[in-house]
Interface confidence: low
């Protein structure tokens, strides 16, 4: 370990701390008998700035004038080099380069709350790179002065720890901050203020809300404030909204009535306070109060649709469907739906409450005129009922919309277009577009979707509950009074070739021809709407091209005759299915020979 500066000294003039741009003289001198042995003129003193040589001199001392030192700390080390030996460290010095403090700017003071303490902030200006002390001085009436010092190099905030009181709210106080370092000092412009200027009230607390008679129209917000508060700002918004409603109130004394709240909505409320109309500053916003407004009876009416299904000569099945009310219409939690079914001529009626579902199915006679009414109920009451006369929606052929088409429109959308019916188009009161997944069995449990369209529209974009690679049965109804006409089409939003072909399950012989029966392709393998089936056949062990028969796809069809087979010839048969995107792979192969020789 080097015994530092035992062999010599490094002195710095004028000082170890210098102003940026100043010149400094560095002297390195050897103590007596500390040079190289024998010949002092062989002493070679070398001055390093950090680890870079900047000067050298033969003799007992070295003088170096250094300029252009950067802001911050620079280390100088003096070393002695003798012949045939390593350099020996003599001594060193750090030089600190900085600037005098700039004038502190934008001095401002605040007292948080009537019981708080005065604290001030300012902008320091550029970094001095030296230790700089800040002194904050506050002078008030009756020659009172307070002083506080800051020992943090980045000091731009000080709390006096004193409390200004409202006894003389108009009394003037003056604050000033002074920055001092070894290169100079600078003071801010004085900041003069009164109690009312700098006291920022504490945010209101203990916020509560009261709904008189559980009604949203009689709502009062309560809170507590510091004693001198004159003004309040209230802001409130539904919890799912980003926009605030703002209200300014004077002399509220901790309460305010709110008149425009929506029912059954969670709101967030905040309040801020101020001591004077035009002096001082607003408090921070209070902590949020979250509260749900009471329910009100539902508004609006349910959108109801229905489906009829023939059961036998005397009975029919009616399935009713309805859509949930929007949140703003429901105005509360819907507890149940009330469905009333009425026979209009005989006056028979039945009412049922439905919970947890938005559909209802019943069986009624095929005779009589039937109507239904559906309403939604919450804890405060019921919506107006939606009334529908049950009719045969497709009975009026002249009301059937024409040229219905369904085309894919981007991801999971289908554009349905049609032409008005031949019968006077002005008779149409509305169109209803209905769609449901196509299931070969005609399954009534498949969810039904619908939308209503104005009578002047001839297209509708359907996107709700539309999945890729699924075929939908789409119906367009034209409704006019108690009559309706309909047209249907199959459509998909996206399609591919089917993943498999139909499975032939039986081949039977009938009067010289054969009847082929097959199982439908599973829905998840159809990959869209099927357009055709193809039946292929060729003689067993033959290399000839197969013959084929193409059958347009119909939902219920699963058999087809072929009468072009030769007797006593063994044939191989198979089937494929086609969508607009292409043909499936082969289904299973079956061999068959006419005249009872089937395998």
């Amino acid at each position: 370990k080097i015994d530092a500066c035992k062999r010599g000294d490094v002195t710095v003039k004028p000082s170890h701390v210098i102003l940026l741009g100043s010149t400094v003289n560095i002297t390195c001198s050897l103590k007596p008998r500390q040079g190289c042995f024998h010949y002092s003129r062989r002493n070679k003193l070398i001055l390093y700035k950090f680890d870079r040589r900047i000067n050298f001199h033969h003799g007992h001392s070295l003088n170096s004038q250094v300029t252009g030192l950067p802001l911050g700390t620079t280390l100088f080390v003096c070393k002695l080099a003798c012949i045939n030996s390593d350099e020996i460290q003599i001594c060193g010095a750090e030089i600190f380069v900085g600037v005098a403090p700039e004038q502190p700017q934008n001095l401002s003071c605040i007292q948080k709350g009537e019981q708080g303490t005065v604290a001030c902030t300012w902008e320091r200006g550029r970094d001095t790179h030296l230790y700089t002390e800040y002194t904050l001085q506050l002078s008030g009436p009756k020659n009172l002065t307070w002083q506080k010092q800051c020992k943090d190099i980045y000091c731009d905030y000080l709390d006096f720890g004193i409390n200004l009181t409202p006894e003389s709210p108009e009394s003037n106080f003056t604050a000033k901050v002074t920055a001092v370092n070894s290169l100079g000092s600078s003071s801010s412009l004085p900041s003069t203020f009164t109690f009312l200027d700098i006291v920022r009230p504490l945010p209101p607390w203990d916020i509560r809300i009261k709904f008189q008679k559980a009604s949203v129209s009689r709502c009062t917000l309560y809170w507590r404030d510091e004693g001198l508060v004159l003004l309040n700002r209230l802001r409130y918004r539904p919890s799912n909204s980003r926009l605030w409603n703002m209200v300014n109130v004077t002399k509220a004394k901790g309460r305010h009535d709110l008149l425009d709240l929506k029912p059954f909505t969670e709101y967030e409320f905040q309040i801020s306070s101020k001591l004077h109309l035009y002096k001082g500053s607003w408090s921070d916003w209070s902590e949020s109060l979250r509260a749900q407004t009471p329910e009100e009876e539902p508004t609006g009416m349910l959108d109801v649709w229905y489906m009829k299904r023939h059961i036998d000569y005397s009975r029919q099945q009616i399935s009713l469907f309805w859509k949930n009310l929007s949140v703003s219409e429901a105005r509360g939690k819907i507890l149940h739906y009330q469905v009333t079914l009425q026979e209009l001529t005989g006056g028979k009626a039945m009412t049922q409450n439905i919970t947890g579902h938005t559909s209802w199915t019943t069986v009624i006679p095929r005779t009589g005129n039937w109507a239904v009414a559906v309403s939604a109920a919450n804890s405060k009451g019921s919506s107006l009922p939606t009334r529908i006369n049950i009719m045969n929606l497709c009975e009026a052929g002249l009301l059937a919309p024409r040229q219905v088409s369904a085309n894919s429109e981007g991801m999971d959308n289908i554009l349905v277009t049609w032409q008005p019916p031949r019968k006077d188009p002005s008779a149409v009161q509305e169109y209803v577009v209905e769609w449901r997944e196509l299931h070969p069995g005609g399954d009534t449990q498949v969810p039904l979707n619908w939308l209503r369209s104005r009578p002047y529209n001839v297209s509708a974009l359907i996107s709700e509950n539309i999945k890729s690679y699924i075929c939908y049965e789409i119906r367009v109804y034209a409704l006019s009074g108690d009559q309706g006409g309909c047209s249907s089409i199959l459509g998909n939003s996206k399609h591919k070739a089917p993943l498999s072909g139909p499975h032939i399950n039986a081949i039977t012989e009938e009067k010289g021809s054969i009847l082929i029966s097959w199982n439908s392709i599973p829905v998840q393998e159809q990959m869209g709407c099927l357009l055709h089936y193809r039946i292929y056949w060729k003689e067993r062990d033959s290399n000839s091209q197969p013959q084929l028969c193409e059958i347009p796809y119909r939902v219920s069809q699963n058999s087809h005759p072929i009468n072009s087979l030769q007797p006593r010839v063994t044939y191989v048969l198979w089937m494929t299915a086609l969508t607009a995107a292409g043909e499936s792979s082969h289904g299973n192969e079956r061999e068959f020979c006419l005249q009872g020789k089937a395998n």
Partner: nanobody, 115 residues
Amino acid sequence: QVQLQESGGGSVQPGWSLRLTCAASGFTFSTSGMHWFRQAPGKGLEWVSSISSGGGDTYYTDSVKGRITISRDNAKNTLYLQLNDLKSEDTAVYYCSKDPSGATRGQGTQVTVSS
């Protein structure tokens, strides 16, 4: 965070000695150059002495050379300042610092020299 705690100050007569200690934590002491500053009553902060991280290089302000010795024990994370032949003008609060501007420093220890 960086913590520096000075101790060892006191009231002494001129010519006496004191050894000041600075206990450091919250940073890698063994790789940091360390510094002593002092502030006399009514004066600004004055740099006194510095020592390199390994302890091999030491520096002193001209007014204290020969009377003051800076040293360190990296194993104990401790910095020392030996004050000999104390004079009345050495009366001040002494601070140890991690940086040469004196920004990161402790609370200080009071040294009072009077007869």
